[in-house]
């Protein structure tokens, strides 16, 4: 049951009648197989649903797929399978939806083995019409749209060719052979790795990184001895094999690969990996795997150049086997990230940072919860959040943590309260302040979603039995109402709402099972009549993000500035509306040493905010010293934290030191010490 589901709760009047008038059922006329759903464009109301049904026969697999379209947010669907000539669509490629509101859709068809190439169906009018196009190659990946121009597509073929189209898939040209990985960069640039000898796998570590800025007319080799590459924010990363051994290091470029700098990060061996956890135009979170099959590594955060890294979090959980990490960007509040660490006793604990990785702490225990059996002290424990790792371990966790940029401060997640993550059935917790404080929102596991920028939260109990009840809250999860959306319960498979959390419609997907058949069914509920009026000024209140000490003038300062938001009052039952824009008022803070990170060759001693020169350079610091670019070795010891906007206050600038003379080591030959590599 839901906390607060009682008479004292602020109940919405006559909600059953209001919702009953706005509940739309659609039964899909096909056998149950798999279903995939895509939204086409933003605020268009257009949804495409692809159902596929496989019958494995002795010799081959017989498949059937159907395509449905809605233009009213899922209230009604029309079977448009005839628009794609009743062709079987390959679900592993999904539906390739164009960027922004381009209205473009590409579906990749299943073709018989002997055909010269694949087949696609293209639409540029929000799936009203489709054009069939036969391809001169068999696609290995989904078509990738250029973020800048939705007419430009790229795809890899099963024979490792890189194919490009300049007219939205009408004509295709192979611009390079022997390609392993290709990605769009900015300004219609394509980056890709190629192999020279055997194959992608055989040449791993000996690949070349190429760039084309004119869709394949001309090329530039921008890296050799490449293991892999990645793009994050304005940074281009490549892991490059070392000359002497089988280790590799990260190199970074901020000019599309024209010039590279070695990142001051540990090198990794064959069995280890690097992973970009998050990146924006200011900085990067990088995970570096620990040697051995430990299942953990270290998070480092970068400076504004992506070159100098500070250790952010030890023993960060990231399984090598399944590639699972709980690292989550809390998009509803700037600077907040949540992840899991593997403690010495092999228990998993949740950590949170409010300052972009500067400091990590445990989550505060919710006031209305007691510590579970994992807690040594029944009065002192923390909230631990279930995310990707718990889901991969098949714990009773139907959903990862949820936050939305336009539902300021709201975070919803499954969790348990103790000294570590518990394998017991979790409850659902909510934070309304970006993760500083938490409250139990619902008992037991649930599916949940945010509508109308936080004005409504919807939840459905996770159950193995058929369901017919949905819960909703208009006060950020304090009080819940239940609505029976159908007399005949369905086997629930998922909640679907338009990405961006601006919609007031929710679709409940599931299937009905009778003696002979099972059919897909959706119920779309429009909450517009629950939120009868538009919100006015009086419905909003001011909230200072990151506030921990009202007495302190610097209260709320993160990365050199604080932000006051206008937020909907919990008791206001009104529509934020589709055009709602988060209102925030930033104010600049005075600088303190906390606004600076230690530059290369400097470190912060325990419990000290000053950066102190390292007495000697060892390990990866020494390697950076030897192979890094000379201009990066001249420093005053401090660099402003990326994105920090502070002004005035402390200015820790001091004399500039040249650290080149420290670049010596008994372990390196004299000639290495004299030569500099850029």
């Amino acid at each position: 049951s839901a906390p607060g589901e009682d008479e004292e709760c602020g109940r919405v009047r006559d909600f059953v009648a209001k919702l009953a008038n706005n509940t739309h059922q659609h039964v899909f006329d096909d056998l149950r197989g798999s279903v995939s759903l895509s939204w086409v464009g933003d605020s268009t109301g257009v949804i495409l649903v692809l159902t596929t049904f496989h019958v494995p026969l002795v010799i081959m697999t017989f498949g059937q797929s159907k395509l449905y379209r809605s233009e009213d947010y899922g209230k009604n669907f029309k079977d448009i399978t005839d628009l794609i000539n009743n062709t079987f669509i390959r679900t592993e490629f999904g539906m390739a939806i164009g960027p922004e509101n381009s209205g473009k859709v590409v579906l990749t068809a299943e073709v018989s083995g002997g055909s010269r190439g694949g087949r696609i169906f293209r639409s540029s009018d929000f799936a009203k019409n489709f054009v069939q196009t036969d391809l001169p190659f068999h696609p290995l990946t989904q078509m990738m749209y250029s973020p800048q121009n939705s007419d430009y597509l790229l795809a890899l073929s099963t024979e490792n060719g890189l194919w490009v189209s300049k007219n939205f898939g009408g004509k295709w040209e192979e611009i390079h052979k022997a390609v392993c990985l290709a990605k769009w960069g900015s300004d219609n640039t394509i980056f890709f790795t190629t192999y020279a000898n055997g194959s992608c796998k055989a040449d791993l570590g000996a690949l070349e990184l190429w760039r084309t800025s004119d869709l394949g007319k001309s090329f530039k080799t921008i890296g050799v001895k490449i293991y892999s590459f990645g793009l994050g924010g304005r940074f281009l990363f490549a892991s490059v094999m070392a000359d002497k051994d089988t280790t590799r290091r990260i190199h970074v470029s901020t000019d599309q690969g024209d010039t590279w700098s070695m990142a001051q990060l540990p090198s990794v061996g064959q069995e280890q990996f690097y992973s970009i956890l998050a990146a924006n135009d200011d900085m990067v979170f990088m995970h570096v795997d620990e040697p051995g099959d430990t299942g953990f590594g270290t998070i480092f955060t970068s400076d504004d150049r992506g070159i100098v890294y500070s250790k952010s979090l030890d023993r960060h959980l990231y399984t090598t086997t399944g590639g699972e990490t709980d690292f989550t960007n809390v998009t509803s509040l700037r600077g907040v990230y949540i992840t899991s660490v593997l403690s010495e006793d092999n228990s998993i604990q949740t950590m949170i940072t409010f300052d972009q990785g500067g400091r990590w702490t445990h989550l505060r225990k919710p006031e209305n919860s007691e510590c579970d059996a994992t807690a040594k002290n029944k009065n002192e424990c923390s909230l631990h959040i279930h995310a990707s790792y718990s889901i991969s371990q098949k714990l009773n966790v139907p959903m990862a943590p949820l936050s939305e940029p336009n539902a300021v401060g709201i975070v919803i997640a499954h969790g348990s309260v103790g000294d570590a993550i518990s394998v017991m059935v979790p409850d659902v917790y909510i934070s309304d302040d970006g993760g500083y404080s938490w409250t139990k929102m619902l008992e037991g596991p649930h599916y949940y979603t945010i509508l109308d920028s936080g004005g409504i939260i919807v939840a459905i109990e996770h159950s193995s039995r058929p369901i017919n009840v949905i819960k909703f809250s208009t006060d950020e999860g304090q009080c819940w109402q239940t609505y029976t959306f159908t007399r005949d319960p369905i086997y629930f498979t998922g909640l679907a709402s338009e990405p961006g959390a601006r919609s007031m419609n929710i679709s409940i997907w599931g299937f009905t099972e009778s003696f002979l058949t099972s059919q897909w069914v959706s119920y779309t509920i429009d909450f517009k009549d629950i939120l009868e009026r538009n919100c006015e000024e009086k419905d909003y209140t001011i909230w200072l993000a990151h506030s921990t000490d009202p007495e302190d003038y610097e209260d709320g300062c993160i990365a050199g500035y604080k932000e006051q938001f206008l937020r909907l009052r919990k008791s206001s039952v009104c529509q934020n509306g589709r055009d709602y824009v988060v209102t925030k008022q930033p104010s600049i803070c005075l600088c303190s040493l906390e606004d600076f990170l230690c530059d290369f060759g400097y470190y912060r001693p325990e419990n000290d905010s000053k950066c102190v020169e390292q007495p000697e350079l060892k390990g990866h610091d020494l390697e950076f010293c030897l192979y890094g670019r000379e201009e990066h070795l001249t420093t005053n010891g401090y660099r402003k934290i990326p994105g920090d906007k502070c002004q005035g206050g402390v200015n820790p600038v001091r004399e500039v030191k040249d650290l080149k003379k420290k670049c010596t080591s008994n372990f390196l030959s004299p000639e290495k010490q004299n030569s500099k590599s850029n």
Partner: antibody, heavy 124, light 107 residues
Framework: QVQLVQSGAEVKKPGASVKVSCKAS????????MHWVRQAPGQGLEWMGW????????RYAQKFQGRVTMTRDTSISTAYMELSRLRSDDTAVYYC?????????????????WGQGTTVTVSS | DIQMTQSPSSLSASVGDRVTITCRAS??????LNWYQQKPGKAPKLLIY???SLQSGVPSRFSGSGSGTDFTLTISSLQPEDFATYYC?????????FGGGTKVEIK
């Protein structure tokens, strides 16, 4: 210690204006809302509005809209409330009160520090 | 505007008595309800905020409960200094509104 000190009693004629000051000390002035509440003789409490000293933003009760102006001078940690076009039923004790804050929320947690009150008498 | 109705408007009680004052909002105000004590010629004093949180420095004999529309202020054992007028106030929806007050007198 935290305190709010208000200006002295005022006697005004109908149609005139009155400006009451409220000097804050012992805390960060810009970090808390300042509310103004009045109490007519023998009556209950009536909220007039608030000012956010940090931004200068205000919100007034509908009843006083157009007649009340709330301002602040952060350099001397002082809030002001000016009421114009005075009538005899504006005779009351006027209080400034600091809005209690909780984890970033500026409203909703009551008024935890009050001034001593300023008596305004409107009489012809 | 949200109307706040306090009851009773006055009550007589003796030292040591348990006293209960109720406050009803004309619509749900979640838990944004505060209680004040006012003595003659003095400014009000915050006792309880957010329906049930005790303001620092206030004796623990004062307690608050409720959420939504119905709220209660309880004085578990009335003391001589508790004879005063008590006001509830909602701070959830603008304009902020106060109840009419409950005067607690000596029996």
């Amino acid at each position: 210690q935290v305190q709010l000190v208000q200006s002295g009693a005022e006697v005004k004629k109908p149609g005139a204006s009155v400006k009451v000051s409220c000097k804050a000390s012992g805390y960060t002035f810009v970090a808390y809302y300042m509310h103004w509440v009045r109490q007519a003789p023998g009556q209950g409490l009536e909220w007039m509005g608030w000012i956010n000293p940090n931004s200068g933003a205000t919100r007034y009760a509908q009843k006083f809209q157009g007649r009340v102006t709330m301002t602040r001078d952060t350099s001397i940690s002082t809030a002001y409330m000016e009421l114009s076009r005075l009538r005899s039923d504006d005779t009351a004790v006027y209080y400034c009160a600091r809005g209690k804050r909780s984890s970033g929320w500026y409203e909703g947690y009551g008024m935890d520090v009050w001034g001593q009150g300023t008596t305004v008498t409107v009489s012809s | 505007d949200i109307q706040m109705t306090q009851s009773p408007s006055s009550l007589s009680a003796s030292v040591g008595d348990r006293v209960t004052i109720t406050c009803r909002a004309s619509q749900s105000i979640s838990s944004y309800l505060n209680w004040y004590q006012q003595k003659p010629g003095k400014a009000p004093k915050l006792l309880i905020y957010a329906a049930s949180s005790l303001q620092s420095g206030v004796p623990s004999r004062f307690s608050g409960s409720g959420s939504g529309t119905d709220f209660t202020l309880t004085i578990s054992s009335l003391q001589p200094e508790d004879f005063a007028t008590y006001y509830c106030q909602q701070s959830d929806v603008s304009p902020i509104t106060f109840g009419g007050g409950t005067k607690v007198e000596i029996k």
